[in-house]
Amino acid sequence: VTCDDYYYGFGCNKFCRPRDDFFGHYACDQNGNKTCMEGWMGPECNRAICRQGCSPKHGSCKLPGDCRCQYGWQGLYCD
């Protein structure tokens, strides 16, 4: 059985489109499961992995490896 584009699995009922944009950064494995690109995490692979050590409470990142501090906090790790 050959599945339509972006459909995977037995019965071709698993849907996955590789993407690399605001809404997700992932490839699809042979079963149609999302595999996040390096630096991204979460079920949709749209949450950047911040600089190692970045404060989860006072820092965040839009891009992998960044660590942007909340107002009132500073330092390499926003701690």
């Epitope: 849907f15 944009d21 605001f22 949709e44 749209n46 990142c61």
Partner: antibody, heavy 119, light 107 residues
């Protein structure tokens, strides 16, 4: 279960701004972007933009760029939509909405917030 | 931007009828299409996603089909609770635009 609870109705003057909130519960707030959709009275649905609460990244419909600002507060799992330079055509119900778990489109919706712009 | 053209804009039908609503995209959206049902004063409810997959708790009388630029929502046997407005929406690339809606009324 996933719940999105929005702030109450607003009456605004032309030229002013409005800020609508959307409190999320029942899932990890930072795992999914929050989208905003509006619907003018008797009209169709219009996608305004989205925010990724984890890092604050945003995507906007160009139609609203410059007038709409999306923000999120991770500590309270609340997303906000601020629309400025209001005009009568902005009178609408504003919805926050979230994708489902397997790349669904908008599976979860807030109850809507009516914003009326009138002098 | 991809535009979505939905037809008809309104439709009168009777309980038990088979009803078809169509949606045409201005570009290939590769099955990245959803259908919603909306009742007055309520938020839209997801019916179908990825063109043909039924969302949770949606009755099997609803079905979706199509590919490329042309898509269809079919209700095989209308029930009283199905009278509402239906919208298609693509989610291939931002902005995720909606069709203009189809108001389904009782004949």
């Amino acid at each position: 279960q996933v719940q999105l609870v929005q702030s109450g109705a607003e009456l605004k003057k032309p030229g002013s701004s409005v800020k609508v909130s959307c409190k999320a519960s029942g899932y990890t707030f930072t795992d999914y972007e929050m989208h905003w959709v509006r619907q003018a009275p008797g009209q169709g649905l219009e996608w305004m933009g989205a925010i990724q609460p984890g890092g604050g990244g945003t995507a906007y419909n160009q139609k609203f760029k410059g007038r709409v600002t999306l923000t999120a507060d991770k500590s309270t799992s609340t997303a906000y939509m601020e629309l400025s330079s209001l005009r009568s055509e902005d009178t609408a119900v504003y919805y926050c909405t979230r994708r489902g778990y397997d790349d669904y489109p908008f599976a979860y919706w807030g109850q809507g917030t009516l914003v009326t712009v009138s002098s | 931007d991809i535009q979505m053209t939905q037809s008809p804009s309104s439709l009168s039908a009777s309980v038990g009828d088979r009803v078809t609503i169509t949606c045409r995209a201005s570009g290939n959206i590769h099955n990245y299409l959803a259908w919603y049902q909306q009742k007055p004063g309520k938020a839209p409810k997801l019916l179908i996603y990825n063109a043909k997959t039924l969302a949770d708790d949606v009755p099997s009388r609803f079905s979706g089909s199509g590919s490329g630029t042309d898509y269809t929502l079919t209700i095989s046997s209308l029930q009283p609770e199905d009278f509402a407005t239906y919208y298609c929406q693509h989610f291939w690339s931002a902005p995720w635009t909606f069709g203009g809606g189809t108001k389904l009324e009782i004949k």
